[in-house]
């Protein structure tokens, strides 16, 4: 067995094993997506988070899972069975994914100001129509999740929520914000926790949540809430995690480039040593 043959054999099984791993990963992601779609309640209790934008994530996870499984399957079968058409398709899919990521990166960096303005418009529109339109649930749940995770409230300030009639209290107690703004770590006051927050948090996980204002979780804006707007919170988060984000993007890109190189190398060299390589299958 020549050096070239053993090298190709190594590449073949390396591609197979790695793509098998990604196939399993993709199927896990897909299963999570389906789990959320079928049974939201048990997923919420499993994850232990009240503010998970389930509706949107179920679809995102399911689609991502299928996509990952699809590409990985092409790589797996193409490498193992030494099928040039599948390896070529695998290379093409990875190239398309890589090109999309590069394009997105360029667009984000060049259109940053426009993108920021668009995000602000979207967020403020989501806040204004909070719990009034059943079709907007995904956006609202996603925004609740952002507030909860980034420990912020509103876009500019918590006061962004004061125009939302459905959250408003009576007369002098008008200023209220959603429970995702509530700073659980800052309170020792068990009364507000026991009577207001916890019962409503547990209810947030359920699929069949009515649209009545009585069923909307809101807290006084003067109590233990996050006082920073999410525009600042988002900037802080991006600033603090910039190295990680760039690192992950570079890592994913290099991984894709690596797999593309290996697949095209295997694809091109299958002709020369096809018969001899077949012995080691």
């Amino acid at each position: 067995m020549s050096a070239q043959e053993s090298c190709l054999s190594l590449i073949k099984y390396f591609l197979f094993v790695f793509n098998l791993f990604f196939f399993v990963l993709g199927s896990l992601i897909f299963c999570f997506g389906i789990w959320i779609l079928i049974d939201k309640t048990s997923f919420v209790s499993f994850v232990g988070l009240a503010f998970v934008p389930l509706q949107i994530w179920s679809k995102v996870l399911a689609i991502s899972g299928i996509f990952t499984m699809g590409i990985a399957l092409l790589g797996c079968v193409g490498a193992l069975k030494e099928l040039r058409c599948l390896l070529g398709l695998y290379f093409g899919m990875l190239l398309l994914l890589f090109a999309t990521q590069i394009t997105l990166g360029i667009l984000i960096s060049t259109q940053r100001v426009r993108l920021e303005r668009r995000v602000q418009e979207l967020v403020l529109r989501t806040i204004q129509s909070y719990r009034t339109n059943p079709d907007e649930t995904a956006a609202e749940e996603s925004w609740d999740y952002v507030q909860f995770q980034l420990r912020c409230c509103g876009w500019h300030y918590p006061q962004d929520w004061f125009q939302v009639l459905i959250l408003r209290g009576n007369g002098s107690e008008a200023h209220r914000v959603p429970c995702s703004c509530y700073n659980l770590s800052a309170t020792n006051d068990s009364t507000i926790l026991d009577k207001v927050i916890l019962p409503q948090l547990s209810r947030l996980g359920h699929l069949a949540r009515s649209r009545h204002s009585a069923d909307i979780c809101a807290v006084p804006a003067e109590s233990h809430i996050y006082r920073e707007g999410c525009a600042q919170g988002l900037q802080k988060w991006l600033h603090n995690n910039l190295i990680s984000i760039v690192g992950i993007c570079l890592g994913v890109g290099l991984l894709e480039l690596g797999f593309m190189t290996l697949s095209i190398f295997l694809c091109r060299n299958l002709d020369h040593v096809y018969n001899r390589l077949a012995r080691y299958r």
Epitope: H156, Y157, Q159, D160, F162, Q163, R168, G171, S172, A174, H175, N183, A186, T187, D189, I192, P220, A221, E222, S223, H224, I225, R227
Partner: antibody, heavy 115, light 107 residues
Framework: QVQVKESGPGLVAPSQSLSITCTVS????????VSWVRQPPGKGLEWLGV???????NYHSALKSRLSIKKDHSKSQVFLKLNSLQTDDTATYYC?????????WGQGTLVTVSA | DIQMTQSPASLSVSVGETVTITCRAS??????LAWYQQKQGKSPQLLVN???NLADGVPSRFSGSGSGTQYSLKINSLQSEDFGTYYC?????????FGGGTKLEIK
């Protein structure tokens, strides 16, 4: 029902510190903000600052360096301290329930800064 | 800081008339505005919050309106107890400010 009452020294010498106590009843300091506002004789209202339910504070930007607001939950009291007083700090000092709009006001305490 | 400009500074009106007081902010305050009434020698009283929301116990002849930077308080058929000084106050951002006040006097 909600009650808010300020108690202050009345007369303070220039360059000294002013301390006013606001005693509240009928609501919890953990869920409500308490604001401080002053009104110089014959003039308009000036917002000084607020202490929120969680103890965090917002201050008037021009007074930030010499103003501090604290509270004691157990005594249901909020404290205002203003350092390095000048004659133009002469005013009626009000404390009010509410951090955003001020729903219940105390009767105010007149503080005169004079030698 | 955001500046609040109130107009007019003073107003002489008869009982039964309708009056409108305006308040202009130096930037968009997104309806985070309150109106107060203060009578001579007394503490201010909240009338309206969130620009349009009537506070507890405030008569329906009072109404607030506006958005962005322009706001107004309207008092329909003035009563004798409505005379005094009116202040607007914004609570957008992290520091609040009051308007200069509008003194409402009996004609």
């Amino acid at each position: 029902q909600v009650q808010v009452k300020e108690s202050g020294p009345g007369l303070v010498a220039p360059s000294q510190s002013l301390s006013i106590t606001c005693t509240v009843s009928g609501f919890s300091l953990t869920t409500s903000g308490v604001s401080w506002v002053r009104q110089p004789p014959g003039k308009g209202l000036e917002w000084l600052g607020v202490i929120w339910g969680d103890g965090s504070t917002n201050y008037h930007s021009a007074l930030k360096s010499r103003l501090s607001i604290k509270k004691d939950h157990s005594k249901s009291q909020v404290f205002l301290k203003l350092n390095s007083l000048q004659t133009d700090d002469t005013a009626t000092y009000y404390c009010a329930k509410g951090g955003y709009s001020l729903a219940h006001w105390g009767q105010g305490t007149l503080v005169t800064v004079s030698a | 800081d955001i500046q609040m400009t109130q107009s007019p500074a003073s107003l002489s009106v008869s009982v039964g008339e309708t009056v409108t007081i305006t308040c202009r902010a130096s930037e968009n305050i997104r309806s985070n505005l309150a109106w107060y009434q203060q009578k001579q020698g007394k503490s201010p009283q909240l009338l309206v919050n969130v620009a349009t929301n009537l506070a507890d116990g405030v008569p329906s002849r009072f109404s607030g309106s506006g958005s962005g930077t322009q706001y107004s308080l309207k008092i329909n058929s003035l009563q004798s107890e409505d005379f005094g000084t009116y202040y607007c106050q914004h609570y957008w951002g992290t520091t609040w400010t009051f308007g200069g006040g509008t003194k409402l006097e009996i004609k």
